[in-house]
Interface confidence: low
């Protein structure tokens, strides 16, 4: 796996593009065995995890070339409730299909500048970015 | 949220430690409503998602001060099968509790060096790091 160039001063590194935004093709950081085509509210008996789940989901691509990672994937639940383990298709209203969220560390590129204001490549700014990872079958909350 | 310093040449930035590894305490990037204490194979009717799931899990901290993010959390399934939606405690052998994995982009700090071999701060190397995000209740694979 070709790693992203290090963030080091570019001055005096004629052979390396150390501060540059990495534009080398990088394998997209897809969830394992990504399945964009599971679009029905049913639990399959084969295929990737998101289609075999009783809280099945699909992935939506979120691409931003000025962010690392450039590609993020958001889960989208295909059913409001969970699918019956028995049939794999009927919904069981005793369970809810809920999104699991995560604040992921991402880096945005911004122009960065030298002492004299000249453009010195791109800087990275660390940010938290909310992504939905998966749909999870949960027991509904019982309010006290 | 105090962002991690930008990756820019340190030369000519006397007031900023732009290339330095940020050692300012950063709020750990915990999964929302993190619950380390859900250690039983049951689906709760309240609390965070990982304890209400019928494939409940706990989180294990993976801390590396030479990595960004420094704190990662790995899901660990608490049950081999899914918990019954009806009772919230008995296992239903028709469903398996499986880990959902993701190759997350992380950055490791490495010493970086100038043209003459002198130490120029720290560089970042991009890597893919396998993390388990959650446990998902799935229908077992039916082999063809």
């Amino acid at each position: 796996y070709s790693h992203w160039p290090s963030c080091c001063p570019s001055k005096g590194y004629p052979s390396e593009e150390l501060l540059r935004w990495s534009t080398v093709p990088v394998p997209p950081l897809k969830p394992a065995s990504l399945d964009f085509h599971s679009v029905s509210c049913r639990a399959s008996e084969d295929g990737p995890l998101n289609s075999r789940a009783i809280s099945p989901w699909r992935y939506e691509l979120d691409r931003d070339l000025n962010r690392l990672p450039q590609d993020l994937y958001h889960a989208r639940c295909l059913c409001p409730h969970c699918v019956s383990l028995q049939t794999g298709s009927h919904m069981d209203p005793r369970g809810n299909s809920e999104l699991l969220y995560h604040n992921q560390t991402v880096f945005y590129r911004r122009p960065c500048h030298g002492k004299k204001g000249n453009h010195k490549g791109y800087c990275l700014e660390r940010r938290l970015y909310r992504v939905s990872l998966a749909c999870v079958c949960v027991r509904p909350r019982v309010m006290g | 949220y105090s962002h991690w310093p930008s990756c820019c040449p340190s030369k000519g930035y006397p007031s900023e430690e732009l290339l330095r590894w940020s050692t300012v305490p950063v709020p750990p990037l915990k999964p929302a409503s993190l619950d380390f204490h859900s250690v039983s194979c049951r689906a709760s009717e309240d609390g965070p998602l990982n304890s209400r799931a019928i494939s409940p899990w706990r989180y294990e901290l993976d801390r590396d001060l030479n990595r960004l993010p420094q704190d990662l959390y790995h899901a660990r399934c608490l049950c081999p099968h899914c918990v019954s939606l009806q009772t919230g405690s008995h296992m239903d052998p028709r469903g398996n509790s499986e880990l959902l994995y993701h190759n997350q982009t992380v950055f490791y700090r490495r010493p970086c060096h100038g043209k003459k071999g002198n130490h120029k701060g720290y560089c970042l190397e991009r890597r893919l790091y396998r993390v388990s995000l959650a446990c998902v209740c799935v229908r077992p694979r039916v082999m063809g």
């Epitope: 570019s10 004629p14 593009e17 540059r20 093709p25 070339l65 204001g117 010195k120 | -």
Partner: antibody, heavy 120, light 113 residues
């Protein structure tokens, strides 16, 4: 005085691959960013993508699946390949240099452009 | 993508008169840390490649006559030709180089009235 010259076939059949080369003279291709831009007849300019002399590339997402830009530092050249062309790819294709030896400013040196027609 | 729009599409100005072209970006291309706008203006004469006139929204390139000036910040920019000359007949494009993909405005055609 750096000069750029585009070369390649002026006529390409639909579904084939358009291939163009930009030759840099009067200076080195090293340490600069180099872009391809196109201009359909009577229309505006569209940035296709750039390459750094080290080989790093960045493409316009609207064309990304069909574009490859490569560099040959030994020949002081960089090239454009655009696959599966249609009539909509008929345009004047320009190569250009970015106005800095280490970053992506505006484009200060342009080739004269070469007209590519996609037709059977 | 950052969308660049220009107005007017075309304008005709008498020799020696002022010509003004505006350019708008769909999001700010001002970098707050150094107060620079990542905007360029190009001139394209018939049958020729574009020529870089102005960088950083207002910095004239070497050899460009001082009748050309750029102004504006954030999302709104202007190219002014203070005293139009016959050789200024061309199409003028603005372009942002803040984020990829780099994008151009649709162009403004300037003619002599």
């Amino acid at each position: 005085q750096v000069q750029l010259q585009e070369s390649g076939p002026g006529l390409v059949k639909p579904s084939e691959t358009l291939s163009l080369t930009c030759t840099v003279s009067g200076g080195s291709i090293s340490s600069y960013y180099w872009s391809w831009i196109r201009q359909p007849p009577g229309k505006g300019l569209e940035w296709i993508g750039f390459i750094y002399y080290s080989g790093s590339t960045n493409y316009n997402p609207s064309l990304k699946s069909r574009v490859t830009i490569s560099v040959d530092t030994s020949k002081n050249q960089f090239s454009l390949k655009l696959s599966s062309v249609t009539a909509a790819d008929t345009a004047v294709y320009y190569c250009a240099r970015h106005d800095s030896d280490y970053e992506l400013y505006g484009m200060d040196v342009w080739g004269q452009g070469t007209t590519v027609t996609v037709s059977s | 993508d950052i969308v660049m729009t220009q107005s007017p599409d075309s304008l005709a100005v008498s020799l020696g008169e002022r010509a003004t072209i505006t350019c708008k970006s769909s999001q700010s291309i001002l970098y707050n840390s150094d107060n620079k706008n990542y905007l360029a203006w190009y001139q394209q004469k018939s049958g020729q490649p574009p020529k870089l006139l102005i960088s950083w929204a207002s910095t004239r390139e070497s050899g460009v006559p001082d009748r050309f000036s750029g102004s504006g910040s954030g999302t709104d920019f202007t190219l002014t030709i203070s005293s139009l000359q016959a050789e200024d007949v061309a199409v003028y494009y603005c372009q942002q180089y803040f984020f990829t993909p780099f994008t151009f405005g649709p162009g403004t055609k300037v003619d002599i009235k």
